[in-house]
Interface confidence: low
C-alpha cells in the first residue's frame, strides 16, 4: 500500500496525539542526553511539517521516508558532537546506514541520575499547571533510559500514568491514592521494558526465524483452538510490528499493532474465546489486553503428535518438502498441548527434534532411527522442572532478601568479572522470580519462571555485549538463545579467575547508610556481599552468612547509636578485620 | 523472473461456482509456494489460499474454508482454485503470487511475483 507522502499518511492513521507522543519516544530513545526541551522543539517542527503533507501530500519533502525526515531532524542538533562524540559521524551517512548507525549508538544503560519522586503535592501542581507538559516529560524519561520500550505501550502507560493523577489529586489523602499507583506502574514499566528487550535481542542477534519460532510457541499455549494458519498469519503479523518497533519505525510499529488488534478482534471466533472482554475497550488498552490474555481452554479431542511426527513413513517426506513449516507446525501442535512449558523448553524440543530428522532423513533407515525422538525430550522436560522445584524450596525456605543472596554468591562465583552493580542488579532480579512464580499452581510454575529468568538473563547479557569482561558470558548469551539459560545454570565456579584484592575502602560505611529505604540498605549489602565472594570466591556458605549477620549486627548498633558517624568510624574497621579473620 | 497470468474469472451468480487458473513461466514453478490472495472495491487485499511444493500443506482462509479448493499441477506449471457456492462477498480481483522462501503462508508480503488479477463477479 503506497502513498505519496508517508508521513501524512502515518499522521492520518494515528491522530495527532499519538503521532507526536511518538515522535517524542523515537526522539528520546535515539538522542537519550538531550534536554527535554530540545525534543519538545523537534517534535513540535516535525508536527508542523506533518500538518502541511496532510494539507497537499505533493508539498515539498512530504514525499521522503520517515527515516530520512527524522534522521534530518536529529542531526540539526547543535551539541551533537559534544554531548554524543561518534554518533554525530552517523549524519554524515546516507539512509539506511544512517538510520542503522542511530540504532547502533542506542544505550542499554545510560549515565542518567535515578529519577527522584517529588513530594505528592508538588506533582499534582506540575499535572495541574501543565498537564500535556507533565504526560511528555514521563515519555520522554522513561524512553531515554529505555531505548527499546514498546512505544505503543508506553503510550498505553501514559494513558494510566494521566489516569491516576487525574484520579489521585483530587482525593482527600493524595498520597495514599498515587504512590500504590505509581509504585505499580514503575514496576510494570521496568518489566514491560526488559521484556520487549529480549524480544529486539532475538530479533537483532538471532533474526525473524529465532522471533517466529518463540511467537509460534507462545501463541500456540495462548490459542490452543486456532488453526495452524491463523497462528500463522498472527505470527508473521506480530513479527512485523516488533521488527518495526525494534528498529526505530515507531509510527509503523504502532500503526500495524493497530491492524492487528483490530485483526484479532474482527475473527476472534477462529482465535480464541478469551478475546471478548479486551476488543470492548479502546486501542491502547485494547492492544495490552490482547497481549496479556490468559491461555484459551486446550481442545478436548486433541490426537498424539506421534502419529504425524513419529509413526507416519512420511515424516521425512513433509520435513524436505518445506522444512520450516513443517517444523511450525510440530511446535504449534506440541505448544497448543502443553501450556505446563516454558516456550524456550518448547523451542528447545522442536530443536531436538530438527536436529532428529536432520540426522536421520540421511540415514539408511530413517523411520528406525526417529522411532524414539520423544524419549529423548524427557531430560530436556527434567531439568527446568527439577531446576523450578529446587529454587522454589530455597525461596520458600530463605526469603526473598536471603534468596536473592543466595543467588548472588552463586552468579559471582559463576561469572566473577561481571561488575559489581550488574550482578547486584541481574541476581536481585533473578530472585524476584520465587514472590512472582513459586506461589502459582504447578502447571503454571515452569512458564513463569524459566521465561521470566529468560528476559532477566537477556539484561545480563545486553549490558555485557556493552563491556565484555567474561568469555563465559559471551559464550551462554551468543551460542543459543533458547539455551541460555541453561547455559548459565550450568556455568561453575570459575577456577581460572584470580580473587580481587581486597580494599578497606569498599568495605567503608557511614551514617549515611541509616537514612537509605529499606531497599537501599539491601542493595548496599548485597553489594558488600558481591565484592566478598570476588574477594574470596572459595568461601563457604556458613562463612558468609556469619560475616553478613556480623555486617547486619554492626550496622543496626551504629544507626541505634547517639553519635552515629563516630560508631561507623569505630566499629567499622573492627567489622573489616573479623571478616578478614572469618574469611582466612 | 517468474511471470503469473490468472484466468477464469467471470460474472456468476449466487450458489454458483468458478475455476479460477494460474500458469507460471520463467522459474522452476515446483520450488515456489503459490497463494491466491484477493481485494474487493475500496477493501484492502486479503489472503484466499496458498499450497505448498508438492500440495502436502494447503491453507484457506476461514471465510472460504470449506467452499474454495486451492490445487497445483507442477507439470503443467499451474495452480487452480475452485469457487464453489459462491456469495456475494466474494467479489473481488482475485490475485495468484509465487513465493520462495515463505515460511508463513497468510502474509502478502512473503510473496515475490504477482500476476495481474482475474475479477469475480458475484451477483443476482
Known amino acids: 500500500d503506497t502513498h505519496k507522502s508517508e508521513v501524512a499518511h502515518r499522521f492520518k492513521d494515528l491522530g495527532e496525539e499519538h503521532f507526536k507522543g511518538l515522535v517524542l519516544v523515537a526522539f528520546s530513545q535515539y538522542l537519550q542526553q538531550c534536554p527535554f526541551e530540545e525534543h519538545v522543539k523537534l517534535v513540535n517542527e516535525v508536527t508542523e511539517f506533518a500538518k502541511t503533507c496532510v494539507a497537499d501530500e505533493s508539498a515539498e519533502n512530504c514525499d521522503k521516508s520517515l527515516h530520512t525526515l527524522f534522521g534530518d531532524k536529529l542531526c540539526t542538533v547543535a551539541t551533537l558532537r559534544e554531548t554524543y562524540g561518534e554518533m554525530a559521524d552517523c549524519c554524515a551517512k546516507q539512509e539506511p546506514e544512517r538510520n542503522e548507525c542511530f540504532l547502533q549508538h542506542k544505550d542499554d544503560n545510560p549515565n542518567l541520575p535515578p529519577l527522584v519522586r517529588p513530594e505528592v503535592d508538588v506533582m499534582c501542581t506540575a499535572f495541574h499547571d501543565n498537564e500535556a507538559t507533565f504526560l511528555k516529560k514521563y515519555l520522554y524519561e522513561v524512553a531515554r533510559r529505555h531505548p527499546y520500550f514498546y512505544a505503543p505501550e508506553l503510550l498505553f502507560f501514559a494513558a494510566r500514568y494521566k489516569a491516576a493523577f487525574a484520579e489521585c489529586c483530587q482525593a482527600a489523602d493524595k498520597a495514599a491514592c498515587l504512590l500504590p499507583k505509581l509504585d505499580e506502574l514503575r514496576d510494570e514499566g521496568k518489566a514491560s521494558s526488559a521484556k520487549q528487550r529480549l524480544k529486539c535481542a532475538s530479533l537483532q542477534k538471532f533474526g525473524d526465524r529465532a522471533f517466529k519460532a518463540w511467537a509460534v510457541a507462545r501463541l500456540s499455549q495462548k490459542f490452543p483452538k486456532a488453526e495452524f494458519a491463523e497462528v500463522s498469519k498472527l505470527v508473521t503479523d506480530l513479527t512485523k510490528v516488533h521488527t518495526e518497533c525494534c528498529h526505530g519505525d515507531l509510527l509503523e510499529c504502532a500503526d500495524d499493532r493497530a491492524d492487528l488488534a483490530k485483526y484479532m478482534c474482527e475473527n476472534q471466533d477462529s482465535i480464541s474465546s478469551k478475546l471478548k472482554e479486551c476488543c470492548d475497550k479502546p486501542l491502547l488498552e485494547k492492544s495490552h489486553c490482547l497481549a496479556e490474555v490468559e491461555n484459551d481452554e486446550m481442545p478436548a479431542d486433541l490426537p498424539s503428535l506421534a502419529a504425524d511426527y513419529v509413526e507416519s513413513k512420511d515424516v521425512c517426506k513433509n520435513y524436505a518438502e518445506a522444512k520450516d513449516v513443517f517444523l511450525g507446525m510440530f511446535l504449534y501442535e506440541y505448544a497448543r498441548r502443553h501450556p505446563d512449558y516454558s516456550v524456550m523448553l518448547l523451542l528447545r524440543l522442536a530443536k531436538a527434534y530438527e536436529a532428529t530428522l536432520e540426522k536421520c532423513c540421511a540415514a539408511a533407515d530413517p523411520h528406525e532411527c526417529y522411532a524414539k525422538v520423544f524419549d529423548e525430550f524427557q531430560p530436556l522436560v527434567e531439568e527446568p522442572q527439577n531446576l523450578v522445584k529446587q529454587n522454589c524450596e530455597l525461596f520458600e525456605q530463605l526469603g526473598e532478601y536471603k534468596f536473592q543472596n543466595a543467588l548472588l554468591v552463586r552468579y559471582t562465583k559463576k561469572v566473577p568479572q561481571v561488575s559489581t552493580p550488574t550482578l547486584v542488579e541481574v541476581s536481585r532480579n533473578l530472585g524476584k522470580v520465587g514472590a512472582k512464580c513459586c506461589k502459582l499452581p504447578e502447571a503454571k510454575r515452569m512458564p513463569c519462571a524459566e521465561d521470566y529468568l529468560s528476559v532477566v538473563l537477556n539484561r545480563l547479557c545486553v549490558l555485557h555485549e556493552k563491556t565484555p569482561v567474561s568469555e563465559k558470558v559471551t559464550k551462554c548469551c551468543t551460542e543459543s538463545l533458547v539455551n541460555r539459560r541453561p547455559c548459565f545454570s550450568a556455568l561453575e565456579l570459575d577456577e581460572a579467575y584470580v580473587p580481587k584484592a581486597f580494599n578497606a575502602e569498599t568495605f567503608t560505611f557511614h551514617a549515611d547508610m541509616c537514612t537509605l529505604s529499606e531497599k537501599e540498605k539491601q542493595v548496599k549489602k548485597q553489594t558488600a556481599l558481591v565484592e566478598l565472594v570476588k574477594h574470596k570466591p572459595k568461601a563457604t556458605k556458613e562463612q558468609l552468612k556469619g560475616v553478613m549477620d556480623n555486617f547486619a549486627a554492626f550496622v543496626e548498633k551504629c544507626c541505634k547509636a547517639d553519635d552515629k558517624e563516630a560508631c561507623f568510624a569505630e566499629e567499622g574497621p573492627k567489622f573489616v578485620a573479623a571478616s578478614q579473620a572469618a574469611l582466612a | 523472473e517468474v511471470q503469473l497470468v490468472e484466468s477464469g474469472g467471470g460474472v456468476v451468480q449466487p450458489g454458483d461456482s468458478l475455476r479460477l487458473s494460474c500458469a507460471a513461466s520463467?522459474?522452476?514453478?515446483?520450488?515456489?509456494?503459490m497463494g491466491w490472495f484477493r481485494q474487493a472495491p475500496g477493501k484492502e487485499r486479503e489472503f484466499v489460499s496458498a499450497?505448498?511444493?508438492?500440495?502436502?500443506?494447503?491453507y484457506y482462509a476461514n471465510s472460504v474454508k470449506g467452499r474454495f479448493t486451492i490445487s497445483r499441477d507442477n507439470s503443467k506449471n499451474t495452480v487452480y482454485l475452485q469457487l464453489n457456492s459462491l456469495r456475494p462477498e466474494d467479489t473481488a480481483l482475485y490475485y495468484c503470487?509465487?513465493?520462495?522462501?515463505?515460511?508463513?503462508?497468510?502474509?502478502?508480503?512473503?510473496?515475490?511475483?504477482w500476476g495481474q488479477g482475474t475479477l469475480v463477479t458475484v451477483s443476482s
Open positions: 503470487a509465487a513465493s520462495r522462501f515463505t515460511s508463513w503462508y497468510t502474509a502478502d508480503y512473503e510473496y515475490d511475483y
Open positions: 520463467g522459474g522452476t514453478f515446483s520450488t515456489y509456494v
Open positions: 499450497i505448498s511444493q508438492n500440495s502436502i500443506h494447503t
